[in-house]
Amino acid sequence: GSTVPPMVNVTRSEASEGNITVTCRASGFYPWNITLSWRQDGVSLSHDTQQWGDVLPDGNGTYQTWVATRICQGEEQRFTCYMEHSGNHSTHPVPSGNSHHHHHHHH
């Protein structure tokens, strides 16, 4: 099949006092191979500080997955979600407040 780029959506939720959990979701992509990771100042976080979901079919012939990490509130600007799929890449910031940030990566 042809390549379908992912829709990337970054959300945030309060974790514990002074911390927030940021989650980066990629959906609607094909083929299933994808790189999705959190970066701090452009540097990938270590594996033990990130949680990944499995790459799963979403029922439309495409796939979805997610990655999450916990960060200190007030440091959001340092963090971005990095996505690489089929030779294309994109960077996604943490939204301010409780807003959601959508970005569709175009080939």
Epitope: Q40, G42, S44, T80, H89, S90, T91
Partner: antibody, heavy 118, light 108 residues
Framework: EIQLVQSGAEVKKPGASVKVSCKPS????????IYWVRQAPGQGLEWIGY????????IYNQQFKDRATLTVDKSTSTAYLELSSLRSEDTAVYYC???????????WGQGTLVTVSS | EIVLTQSPATLSLSPGERATLSCSAS???????LHWYQQKPGQAPRLLIY???NLASGIPARFSGSGSGTDFTLTISSLEPEDFAVYYC?????????FGQGTKVEIK
């Protein structure tokens, strides 16, 4: 091969501005942050700031926030550092560097000497 | 701001000797955020060790790094002529990103 090529040496008068360019090659320009660091003669390394070329986000060392401006031109895959209101203490070699997968500075430009003298 | 203090400022050794360089942080740093760079005269720094103990690409195995918390060490097991240079530690855990003042390894 990953390379970062910087513009040539500059001599400036106090109060003037200087703009240094950095052109990386060998990787996708927007996939890694570009950092800027300076080194005064015989001194250590001082971080100025970085820019994410994909989204244009800039983080400055507060010490340089008022005088440094980081920009990128995605059409030419070039990053720029502009430093204004130059003084003699700004005489230094200015380096650009690329953020790495596991460290802040994994490849460096050759450096640009900026001399501020009346 | 996390201040990194390197010691000694200068280390005078002969080729073949062991070099031990220290980097002390003013606040605790996760080992994931401590890196070492080598700089030779007239050249840009180059990444030597990342995340406390991992050798960067092309760096010989005589270099090693260790440490945790506030105390980190770079060791060169047997100095080669090309190892005489200035070495900097750097932390990426908190802003501003900071470097140590450097340790110069010179020929005795």
């Amino acid at each position: 091969e990953i390379q970062l090529v910087q513009s040539g040496a500059e001599v400036k008068k106090p109060g003037a501005s200087v703009k240094v360019s950095c052109k990386p090659s060998g990787y996708a320009f927007t996939s890694n942050n570009i950092y800027w660091v300076r080194q005064a003669p015989g001194q250590g390394l001082e971080w100025i700031g970085y820019i994410d070329p994909y989204i244009g986000r800039i983080i400055y060392n507060q010490q340089f926030k008022d005088r440094a401006t980081l920009t990128v031109d995605k059409s030419t895959s070039t990053a720029y550092l502009e430093l204004s209101s130059l003084r003699s203490e700004d005489t230094a070699v200015y380096y650009c560097s690329r953020s790495g997968e596991r460290s802040n500075f994994d490849y460096w430009g050759q450096g640009t000497l900026v001399t501020v003298s009346s | 701001e996390i201040v990194l203090t390197q010691s000694p400022a200068t280390l005078s050794l002969s080729p073949g000797e062991r070099a031990t360089l220290s980097c002390s942080a003013s606040s605790s740093i996760s080992s994931n955020y401590l890196h070492w760079y080598q700089q030779k005269p007239g050249q840009a720094p180059r990444l030597l060790i990342y995340r406390t103990s991992n050798l960067a690409s092309g760096i010989p195995a005589r270099f090693s790094g260790s440490g945790s918390g506030t105390d980190f060490t770079l060791t060169i097991s047997s100095l080669e002529p090309e190892d005489f240079a200035v070495y900097y530690c750097q932390q990426g855990g908190s802003l501003p990103l900071t470097f140590g003042q450097g340790t110069k390894v010179e020929i005795k």
